[in-house]
Interface confidence: low
């Protein structure tokens, strides 16, 4: 479009942009303001992403995968801003984008490397498989491959099984740990190095409680201050394990300060909840209440699991009636 004799060629600048799957990002590019601006964004130097000249977009030859996903900051072009607004990035968008900007006096080439990360909130689950107990740290969708570390009583464990499956866009990771017969506390950390995002799961086993029929039991559940931040949204769930599966007794959502109780004999102290103490009471115990009780406090950055084992024994009266 311009006579090349007038061009000053400016060496390529390179920047790295890290985006999150399905979020919008900006690929930056600036130039020294000038008249008759031409902007071409290309991917891997071959696919046309966005073209602008003579004061408007020219998207006739735009690659179909970018349709309705790109735009420039039109009011700022005259100020030297050729940045590209890019909607809903996917892992397939990763790669090198080159922005060529021409004005009446020079051509500038800017390179932007786009890396895309995925980190759907992980979970820590407690499972019984036959006679074995397992803690499983898992993340449904993560990219690139995360760093998973386990600690037992704050000491790193080198054994680290990782079950990995790939889907079109990311990895799905399970890291199981056999904790059969252990009373230790466990911690699992999953780190996405690209997004600089870390999630921690912590599991604590409380001493077993022996109670008589028709008594009540108080089960403690207080978050560890290292992880817990009350101004962050979180959810607390109390559940009971019966024959290998958990049934939810009650849950609390911090965002709405809502408590939902599914078991009439379950009670929560509102005042304690306001002090971030999620201990619960179960009234009028019967023999079928024996089992494992799990308190799960979860947010985007952590899961804290506390497990109690309750043994309910027949009262003397019941025993003598039989």
């Amino acid at each position: 479009i311009f006579p090349l004799a007038f061009f000053i060629y400016v060496p390529m600048n390179e920047q790295i942009v890290i985006g999150r799957l399905d979020e919008d990002i900006i690929l930056p590019s600036s130039f020294e303001r000038g008249s008759e601006v031409v902007i071409h964004w290309k991917y891997q130097d071959s696919y046309k992403v966005h073209s602008y000249y003579k004061g408007s977009d020219h998207l006739e030859s735009q690659d179909p995968r970018y349709a309705n996903r790109t735009s420039l900051f039109y009011n700022e072009i005259q100020n030297g801003n050729a940045s590209l607004f890019f909607r809903r990035v996917s892992l397939l968008d990763e790669g090198i984008y080159t922005c060529y900007v021409g004005t009446a006096i020079q051509v500038i080439t800017n390179k932007v490397v786009l890396k895309v990360g995925v980190f759907l909130t992980p979970v820590m689950k407690y499972e019984k498989r036959n006679t074995n107990s397992f803690l499983i740290c898992s993340v449904l969708s993560v990219y690139p491959r995360p760093i998973i570390t386990w600690k037992m009583d704050n000491t790193p464990i080198s054994e680290n099984n990782m079950e990995e499956t790939g889907s079109l866009d990311s990895f799905s990771i399970n890291s199981p740990l056999n904790i059969t017969g252990s009373n230790s506390s466990y911690e699992c950390t999953i780190e996405n190095s690209l997004l600089k995002q870390t999630w921690t799961g912590r599991w604590t086993m409380k001493d077993g409680l022996h109670k008589m029929q028709s008594e009540h039991v108080s089960l403690s559940c207080q978050p560890v201050n290292d992880y817990f931040s009350p101004n962050q949204d979180f959810k607390v769930t109390w559940s009971r394990m019966k024959s290998g599966t958990f049934s939810v007794l009650a849950y609390y959502l911090s965002s709405s300060q809502n408590t939902i109780i599914n078991e009439s004999r379950f009670s929560w102290n509102k005042e304690l909840i306001n002090q971030s103490d999620f201990s619960m009471n179960l009234m009028d115990l019967n023999l079928s209440d024996s089992g494992e009780y799990l308190c799960n406090i979860s947010s985007d950055e952590y899961t804290l699991l506390t497990i109690h084992t309750v043994h309910v024994e027949p009262s003397q009266e019941t025993a003598s009636h039989n």
Epitope: Q44, G95, V113, I147, G166, S167, L168
Partner: antibody, heavy 116, light 107 residues
Amino acid sequence: QVQLQQSAAELARPGASVKMSCKASGYTFTTYTMHWVKQRPGQGLEWIGYINPSRGYSDYSQKFQGKSTLTTDKSSNTAYIQLTSLTSEDSAVYFCARGGYDFDYWGQGTTLTVSS
Amino acid sequence: DIVMTQSHKFMSTSVGDRVSITCKASQDVGTAVAWYQQKPGQSPKLLLYWASTRHTGVPDRFTGSGSGTDYTLTISSVQAEDLALYHCQQHFITPYTFGGGTKLEIK
């Protein structure tokens, strides 16, 4: 389990072209990029480039641009590298490797000898 | 392109020794460094990625450290089967580049 099976050794004349293959099994082929790496006898590793089988796009090291072409056949889970205008400098072992950023599984390598 | 330099082409060690192999990048690669082990006549095997994370099945005598431009692979107690060529690689930006390799020899 993940396996990358590469084609047999090749002997070629200078100026000729050669196409080597890498058949993947044990995982979803379109999920991971496939990289190609060159190793001359007693030397280090050189990254040639990669191809994304899902989209078919490829990215090459400048040194190998024009020398190599990467392709895939999704129906047979196979990746290919074609090398053209062969010279003795192209004599090497060529590896395919499954990518994320790091290369977690490698083929056994295909030895290319260019000789008149 | 980012240049990865392994300053020692050869390193000699004894079984049971601790050995550290170093790798220097020509620019900051943000811990995006992988280490590979290659035994004679075999293809490379991934040991570590993101500078310090062990790949599945890699013995815990192999550890990695580093940030910015300087990275180290350490074998805490060398075994006879560790005799191999060790490559570092940056997986920060394409073109991905490898170091020249360090050959670990057993005395």
